[in-house]
Every structure is written in C-alpha cells, then in structure tokens.
C-alpha cells in the first residue's frame, strides 16, 4: 500500500491532523523534499548575518556576513571577524603576525615564510607581515659566468643606431 504522504511535493507537508492531506508549509517554514510530515523552520539572518537568499516554501534562507566579518562553517553558520593583512585572529582579537610569519588575507592564520634554502634558492625579496619572501635563483646560479638568467637587452636610446 502506497504511503499517501509520498505524494506531497516540496513546499508542503503531510498533515496528520487533516487526514494526511498535503498542506502548504506555514509562513517562516519550508520543506525542500517531498513526503515530509513537517516543515522546517526558516533560518533567520539577523545581527551580524545578512540575508543572501530569502526563505521560500521549498528552500531555506541563506546568510552571509556583514562587512568586517566573513563566513565560517557549513552554510555560513558563523561569522568571524576580519583582521587586517599581516594579522591573525586570536582569542584576544586581531594580533600582528610574529616575525618570520605572514598573512596576505583578512582571515586565516599567519604562516611561516618560505624557507628558500630548502629548495636551494636564495631570498630575492624579504618577507613582511603581509607578504611571503620571494625566492630567487640558487646561490650557485648567481656565481660569475654561471648565470642562467638572461639579462635584459639594454634599452636603446632614440636616435642611435646599434653599434
């Protein structure tokens, strides 16, 4: 025998109080699949949250975060404070990255600078709190007569023919 509730489409619920007929989800609720015996409460996007997509009878609301905060967790279940580049969020708030670490985003943790020597390379540009070091050619490549980097051709001055 087929369950009469299986005929109830998304946006409705199978109402036991009304002889299992399909009733529309009440305001502030939804059912995203058919055959539901209850509708789920719509999520509210208030306070630090903003509504990205309104709740409908067939789908839940979707939230994002107010400026200065970013989403964390499945479906933006939390809003975490942004920090500046060169900082990370701790339990005491935003703190500058320690020497030797950097963060080039407004979220996440400070990460150690790349250790160029592990790849047999030298430091071309020093790291900062906001930026990783830039590794250059290996020290061996920089020895006289062993350059593997083709130097740029000298710029010609206008009005002069090549020698």
């Amino acid at each position: 025998l087929q369950d009469p509730c299986s005929n109830c489409p998304a946006g409705t619920f199978c109402d036991n109080n009304r002889n299992q007929i399909c009733s529309p989800c009440p305001p502030n609720s939804f059912s995203s699949a058919g055959g539901q015996r209850t509708c789920d409460i719509c999520r509210q996007c208030k306070g630090v949250f903003r509504t990205r997509k309104e709740c409908s009878s067939t789908s839940n609301a979707e939230c994002d975060c107010t400026p200065g905060f970013h989403c964390l967790g499945a479906g933006c279940s939390m809003c975490e404070q942004d920090c500046k580049q060169g900082q990370e969020l701790t339990k005491k708030g935003c703190k500058d990255c320690c020497f030797g670490t950097f963060n080039d985003q407004k979220r996440g943790i400070c990460r150690p600078w790349t250790n160029c020597s592990l790849d047999g390379k030298s430091v071309l540009v020093n790291g900062t709190k906001e930026r990783d070091v830039v590794c250059g050619p290996s020290p061996a490549d920089l020895s006289p007569g062993a350059s593997s980097v083709t130097p740029p051709a000298p710029a010609r001055e206008p009005g002069h023919s090549p020698q």
């Epitope: 502030n28 509210q44 905060f69 404070q81």
Partner: antibody
C-alpha cells in the same frame, strides 16, 4: 547543559559605572549572541544590547551612549559596562543567550539586582 | 513605553482557554518571527514559544502561538493554577537590528 551566571556589585552610586560579568558554563560561547536585558522593579523587560561571539555588537538606542559590551572567549565570559548611572538604572540585570538561527533567548542567567543609590 | 503592545492583564478559570495578544509593526512582528517568555515572580524569564509556534522541549502542548500580519497571540488551553505568571512577547526589530519586547501581561488564574 549551558548555564549563565551574572556577577557584579549590588549597590552602585549615581554617576558611577556599573560593571557586570556573565560567565558561560557547560558549553561554548562560540556561534551565539550574548545579550543583556534588564527589568526595573515592577516593570517589563528592556533589551540593553548584545554581542556576537566574534565581537559584533549592537545596543538599544536609548542606552547606546552609555553602554559597552565585550566578550572574552578564552574565559567564556562577556561583560556589560553602563556609565553615568542614575536611580532609573536600578533593576534586575539578566544575561541571556540568543540563538543565531531562530533568535530566541533560550538560556538565561538567574539575574542580579543592581541598586543605584548614594 | 514598549515597542510591542500587550494587554497588562488577563485572567481565566482553571480548564479555560485564554489568549494574550501582542501587536507590533512591519519592522518587527510583520517581518520577523515572534517569541514568547514566561516569568514567575523573582525568577528569570523562560523561553516558552519560539518562531511563532514552536515549543522548546519540556513545554506542554497546552501552550501554542500564532502570528498574523503585525500581530501575534499566545493561547493557553486547559488553564492551570501554575500558569499564573507574567508573559512577554518579543520579536527582532529590523530598524534596531535587535530584539524588542512587549510590556508584559500578568495572567491570573481565578
């Protein structure tokens, strides 16, 4: 289960600053709003303000110039500071957890009575 | 002056059904779910109904909530003497970006 406990002075002089702390036990302070509500003797409930665990705050416009709410997630505590007190600030002060999905205040502290008097 | 309007008092006899109304505006009840709280003398309020009509676990099904437009109501059927308490409605207010309360209704069981 989660429990809230208010602490602070019961008697404060006019023009001084009230400092109250709410300690959250039995659960995390993360992913909820934490509110302060007060109730003057024989009167109704008045929302003072809230703080989200990550630092977002909002205050009742009628009190905004005098109030500050802060959170210390490492101690699982949040605090209320209300300055320039007058006798009209005499009330029972409650801290409460506000759910961040449906926004009901589902856990309350037992309340602390604050009297403003010289 | 509370943002949400409730009658200051209501009464009923044991077994009766009583309703408490709560009136607001488009920025609060009209656009947001309503919560109800029960408060006994000398104790903290307790969440009784959330999201218009949902009961937290442990709340008897004698308590029910509903909302229409910018008004909401709390109904208590089969009134009991232990229901004598103050009842407050509350809703988020979009213009404040925070909650607003009704002034409270003192329910007396005669």
């Amino acid at each position: 289960q989660v429990q809230l406990q208010e602490s602070g002075p019961g008697l404060v002089k006019p023009s001084e600053t009230l400092s109250l702390t709410c300690t959250v036990s039995g659960g995390s302070i993360s992913s909820y709003y934490w509110s302060w509500i007060r109730q003057p003797p024989g009167k109704g409930l008045e929302w003072i303000g809230y703080i989200y665990y990550s630092g977002y705050t909002n205050y009742n416009p009628s009190l905004k110039s005098r109030v500050n709410i802060s959170v210390d997630t490492s101690q699982n505590q949040f605090s209320l500071k209300l300055n320039s007190l007058t006798a009209a600030d005499t009330a029972v002060y409650y801290c409460a957890r506000t759910h961040s999905y449906y926004y009901g205040m589902d856990v309350w502290g037992q309340g602390t009575t604050v009297t403003v008097s010289s | 002056q509370s943002v949400l309007t409730q009658p200051p008092s209501a009464s009923g006899t044991p077994g009766q059904r009583v309703t408490i109304s709560c009136s607001g505006s488009s920025s609060n009840i009209g656009n947001n779910p309503v919560n109800w709280y029960q408060q006994f003398p000398g104790t903290a309020p307790k969440l009784l109904i959330y999201s218009n009509n949902q009961r937290p676990s442990g709340v008897p099904d004698r308590f029910s909530g509903s909302k229409s437009g910018t008004s909401a109501s709390l109904a208590i059927s089969g009134l009991q003497s232990e229901d004598e308490a103050d009842y407050y409605c509350e809703a988020w207010d979009d213009s404040l970006n925070g909650p607003v309360f009704g002034g409270g209704t003192k329910l007396t069981v005669l």
